[in-house]
Interface confidence: low
């Protein structure tokens, strides 16, 4: 997170830290005791699928305070439409091997109903993004969990206000832009997969996933997030279905 | 709409203003009261805009110069009281007033619903947690707010 602040301990209780072979991989969002939402691109280069760990209740990576809960990732489900190395359909659903125990420091973020997300949450201007990613473009990652308030843009406005870059990916209907184009604040590498959380009438909801951008906090560019509302039914159907063998599963979308 | 005015001084009103064209000053002489004269004059000079009963759904009409005002019953709104307020209570309008989820129904009004772990309160719009750790709430902030001293 560039230009953010420390999320006070316990105030981002749905934040997940994903580790592979003990190393920081990505962020994620707890949506109930056994399921985590993250970004598909986090798993593009994974070889040791059985060494994926999700940590809940984490705050400061340099110390262990007893509120952390670690769980093996039993399954990673990615939409069949996602192509590794690209940006569209950048979402993954992770099933934990054992459920986490909900505490003051481990709480799920609400996965909203699609219509509510599209016609109400999408029009809430500011939302929070968080993670232990880089504090500057090409800089060091954070030890304490960082959080940043970002404004959401209509895709048309995002395109008009962004500098044209020849090989820039399209901003599809499965994405949205948020943040600032003045180079001051943005999510960054290492924050990928983490939550874009929107507050409405006293409750927080998952509206986006940290996905991609032109560098981090680059002048003339905004951060791009996976538009979670497009995947609500897909996620709900998968969470209701029987577990399938194998760690990586490509599930038909839509 | 202004029949009550005609009962006030029927003789002089007929003589001065019905049989012949009267001026505002002559009307003022008949009514001896500025407010009543004004009410009469609005209707007399440019016709009674309420004559066509433009106010719907039991609304009452007040004539104005070249226009009218409808006073609507509580359940209605709009220039002619043509809009049932409940028709505005739909999910695209401020989430239907619902705290969480809103459903529109054909033929009936919208209903509010809550996420798993919450239940609908008696007001029909608010949601209250039914579990210790409902999604989307931050326990340490909820507890901090709950223990704040109340203003007196």
């Amino acid at each position: 997170i560039v230009g953010g602040k420390v999320c006070p301990k316990g105030e981002c209780p749905w934040q997940v830290l994903l580790l592979v072979n003990g190393a920081q991989l990505c962020g994620g969002t707890l949506i109930n005791t056994i399921w985590v939402v993250s970004a598909a691109h986090c798993f593009d280069k994974i070889k040791n699928w059985r060494n994926l760990i999700a940590v809940l209740g984490e705050h400061d990576l340099s110390e262990h305070d007893g509120d952390e809960q670690s769980r093996r990732v039993a399954q990673v489900i990615i939409p069949s439409t996602y192509v590794p190395g690209t940006t569209n359909h950048d979402i993954a659903l992770l099933r934990l091997h054992q459920p986490v125990v909900l505490t003051d420091h481990v709480v799920p973020l609400c996965l909203p109903e699609r219509t509510f997300s599209e016609r109400t949450l999408a029009f809430v201007r500011f939302s929070l993004v968080s993670g232990w990613g880089q504090l500057l473009d090409r800089g060091a990652t954070a030890l304490e969990l960082m959080v940043l308030n970002v404004p959401r843009l209509m895709t048309q406005d995002c395109l008009q206000q962004s500098r044209k870059v020849g090989d820039s990916p399209n901003i599809t209907e499965y994405m949205f832009c948020a943040g600032y184009s003045d180079g001051s604040k943005d999510s960054c590498k290492g924050d990928s997969g983490g939550p874009h959380a929107t507050h409405y009438r006293g409750t927080w909801y998952l509206t986006g996933i940290v996905s991609w951008g032109q560098g981090c906090a680059t002048v003339g560019h905004f951060g791009v997030y996976t538009r979670v509302s497009q995947y609500i039914e897909w996620l709900q159907k998968l969470m209701r279905s029987e577990p399938r063998p194998g760690v990586l599963l490509r599930a038909p979308f839509p | 709409a202004n029949a009550f005015l005609e009962e006030l001084r029927p003789g002089s009103l007929e003589r001065e203003c019905k049989e012949e064209q009267c001026s505002f000053e002559e009307a003022r002489e008949i009514f001896k009261d500025a407010e009543r004269t004004k009410l009469f004059w609005i209707s007399y000079s440019d016709g009674d805009q309420c004559a066509s009963s433009p106010c719907q759904n039991g609304g009452s009409c007040k004539d104005q110069l070249q226009s009218y005002i409808c006073f609507c019953l509580p359940a209605f709104e709009g220039r002619n009281c043509e809009t049932h307020k409940d028709d505005q209570l739909i999910c695209v309008n401020e989430n239907g007033g619902c705290e969480q989820y809103c459903s529109d129904h054909t033929g009936t009004k919208r209903s509010c619903r809550c996420h798993e772990g919450y239940s609908l309160l008696a007001d029909g719009v608010s949601c209250t947690p039914t579990v210790e750790y409902p999604c989307g709430k931050i326990p340490i902030l909820e507890k901090r707010n709950a223990s704040k001293p109340q203003g007196r």
């Epitope: - | 409940d86 209570l89 239907g96 007033g97 619902c98 129904h105 033929g107 009936t108 009004k109 919208r110 209903s111 509010c112 619903r113 809550c114 239940s119 609908l120 309160l121 008696a122 007001d123 029909g124 719009v125 209250t128």
Partner: antibody, heavy 122, light 107 residues
Framework: QVQLQESGPGLVKPSQTLSLTCTVS?????????WSWIRQPPGKGLEWIGY???????NYNPSLKSRVTISVDTSKNQFSLKLSSVTAADTAVYYC???????????????WGQGTSVTVSS | EIVLTQSPATLSLSPGERATLSCRAS??????LHWYQQKPGEAPRLLIK???QPATGIPARFSGSGSGTDFTLTISSLEPEDFAVYYC?????????FGQGTKLEIK
């Protein structure tokens, strides 16, 4: 015109389960509203037992929650009350009722059944 | 839970007189208060919802007022059929609760 009619045994033995059904006519139970059970012990006031919302969610009075189940059978346009482990204190007239649970109509009970008397006695 | 206290417990008046019934809530309930009338052997009947809105078909002599914690049901001129028990109901928060009732009897 919406009509509600309670039915069930008038006498229940202590420790058994009281079961009542409310049949709704003139209105589809699944289209909207909150469908409630309210009781009134002899010579006393009214006590709200709980409701089932048309979508299926329920809410019960905490004082009875551990013993109450309200369910709905949309195919028969009925909703039911089960109250377990009854004692003499559960002797009352039981009413089923409908409140139009919209914004601006906060559980005002506009429609009531005529009530059915239940005695708990051995 | 919200406790509703009605007063007086019994009110003795004659037809034609004005009746004023009170309902006090243990905490603020905005205007989420409803009034019911119950005659012997009958189910309650909704009179006033939302503190002051008459239910369908209720005569104009019945009116309600108040807000927050103090509420009043007024019957401007008593008719013989108005002698009954009157209950107020909290519609603000669960559990939904009723007052203990005011019995309006003929003097």
């Amino acid at each position: 015109q919406v009509q509600l009619q309670e039915s069930g045994p008038g006498l229940v033995k202590p420790s058994q389960t009281l079961s009542l059904t409310c049949t709704v006519s003139g209105y589809s139970i699944s289209s909207d509203s909150a469908w409630s059970w309210i009781r009134q012990p002899p010579g006393k006031g009214l006590e709200w037992i709980g409701y089932i919302y048309y979508s299926g969610s329920t809410n019960y009075n905490p004082s009875l929650k551990s013993r109450v189940t309200i369910s709905v059978d949309t195919s028969k346009n009925q909703f039911s009350l089960k109250l377990s482990s009854v004692t003499a204190a559960d002797t009352a007239v039981y009413y089923c009722a409908r409140s139009v649970n919209y914004y601006g109509n906060s559980f005002a009970v506009g429609y009531w059944g005529q009530g059915t008397s239940v005695t708990v006695s051995s | 839970e919200i406790v509703l206290t009605q007063s007086p417990a019994t009110l003795s008046l004659s037809p034609g007189e004005r009746a004023t019934l009170s309902c006090r809530a243990s905490q603020g309930i905005s205007d989420y208060l409803h009034w019911y009338q119950q005659k012997p052997g009958e189910a309650p009947r909704l009179l006033i919802k939302y503190t002051s809105q008459p239910a369908t078909g209720i005569p104009a002599r019945f009116s309600g007022s108040g807000s927050g914690t103090d509420f009043t049901l007024t019957i401007s001129s008593l008719e013989p059929e108005d002698f009954a028990v009157y209950y107020c109901q909290n519609g603000h928060s669960f559990p939904l609760t009723f007052g203990q009732g005011t019995k309006l009897e003929i003097k």
